[in-house]
């Protein structure tokens, strides 16, 4: 079992870990479709990690600890994009993770509802946006979900940050 998150370190009693859900506007787009702006949240913060020199034989205490600011609760919603002029594919559905709450959690921990957006491929075109992940933390969501080598055009991205939670 992963160790519980650390909020204070003895060496730095004046510093506390923090992790917040920041309101963002996220653009969801796809080549040839009208982009949609949705309100979402991103996890942003500073969580503690440390690494203590090891010994042999190894001590029983954990020498390495890593917490990351990541979704504590999220849900996946369908965002439907209208694609005018495309008779064969008049609409495109995308799954988008809506982050509800964030917290410092063990770096390897699975978020509550994880998975990657079912990204769709297509060259940049009207309504499509350059793709960058909207998550400030670099940890991919584990659990068998496999990212593409790079975000394809049309992947959702952050347009701007809004007010704090």
């Amino acid at each position: 079992a992963a160790p519980p998150p650390i909020n204070k370190l003895a060496l730095f009693p004046d510093k506390s870990a923090w992790c917040e859900a920041k309101n963002i506007t996220q653009i969801v787009g796809h080549s040839g479709c009208e982009a949609k702006s949705i309100q979402n949240r991103a996890c942003l913060g500073q969580c503690f990690s440390y690494s203590v020199p090891n010994t042999f034989p190894q001590s029983t205490e954990s020498l390495v600890h890593c917490d990351s600011c990541m979704p504590a609760q999220s849900m996946w919603e369908i965002v439907t994009l209208e694609c005018p002029g495309h008779e064969e594919v008049p609409r495109v559905d995308k799954l988008v993770e809506k982050i509800l709450h964030c917290s410092c959690q063990a770096c390897g921990k699975e978020p509550s509802h994880e998975g990657l957006s079912v990204y769709v491929q297509g060259e940049d075109g009207p309504g499509s946006q350059p793709g960058t992940h909207p998550h400030p933390h670099p940890h991919p969501h584990p659990g068998g979900q496999t990212p593409e080598p790079e975000d394809p055009p049309g992947a959702p991205h952050t347009e701007e940050e809004g007010a704090e939670d």
Epitope: S74, M75, W76, E77, I78, T80, E88, V89, R91, V92, D93, L95, K98, H113, G115, L116, S117, V118, Y119, V120, Q121, G122, G144, Q145, T146, P147, E148, P152
Partner: antibody, heavy 121, light 110 residues
């Protein structure tokens, strides 16, 4: 006319891994434009959605099964596959592969005929 | 226990009309499109309705779909004996972050 065909062992022992393959004919997985799924139906019961895969390899799994499920795609063989680990008798079901209507979530317009998988020792 | 609630069975005479209900909540039917499937005995399900009320090509106009609030309805007119089957509704559930189906309704044509 796109057709789907499931294949794999009909009997799996408890605690082992269930492995099924769906072969797509009459169309190419790698052309994009479709999401591909696995769905199962327990004997005499309703349908349960297992997960999605896109030709690029992106996956999305039902959270209730995610810890045991792996879906993969082999575009060179025009196939996608399901692996379900640590199976129990509760995983006994007819397993279907299906295709979503063009880039829609949850509108499965083409189905395989299904393959019955029994979990028993 | 299915997330979406359907009546276990409905019946009507040939030539009559029948409706099958599918009840959910705001996290599924209330905010997402509904699909309907027909499963004839011993066969795979077949898509009848998608986007609440659209029919794929080849599906006769005897089949119709509608949605109001957190409920959806499948209508079948001019019933035929060949319509005897199990019917399932399906949609996305945002709270569960998964696709969900109803428990199915067995239609008997008397």
């Amino acid at each position: 006319q796109v057709q789907l065909q499931e294949s794999g062992p009909g009997l799996v022992k408890p605690s082992q891994t269930l492995s099924l393959t769906c072969t797509v004919s009459g169309g190419s997985i790698s052309s994009g434009g479709y999401y591909w799924s696995w769905i199962r139906q327990h004997p005499g019961k309703g349908l349960e959605w297992i997960g999605y895969i896109y030709y690029s390899g992106s996956t999305y799994y039902n959270p209730s099964l995610k810890s045991r499920v792996t879906i993969s795609v082999d575009t060179s063989k025009n196939q996608f596959s399901l692996k379900l680990s640590s199976v129990t008798a509760a995983d006994t079901a007819v397993y279907y592969c299906a295709r979503d209507a063009p880039l829609r979530i949850g509108a499965f317009d083409i189905w395989g005929q299904g393959t019955m998988v029994t979990v028993s020792s | 226990q299915s997330v979406l609630t359907q009546p276990p069975s409905v019946s009507a005479a040939p030539g009559q009309k029948v409706t099958i209900s599918c009840s959910g909540s705001s996290s599924n039917i209330g905010n997402n499109y509904v699909s309907w499937y027909q499963q004839l005995p011993g066969t795979a399900p077949k898509l009848l309705i998608y986007d609440n009320n659209k029919r794929p090509s080849g599906i006769p106009d005897r089949f119709s779909g509608s949605k109001s609030g957190t409920s959806a309805t499948l209508g079948i007119t001019r019933l035929q004996t060949g319509d005897e089957a199990d019917y399932y509704c399906g949609t996305w559930d945002s709270s569960l972050s998964a696709g969900v189906f109803g428990g199915g309704t067995k239609l008997t044509v008397l």
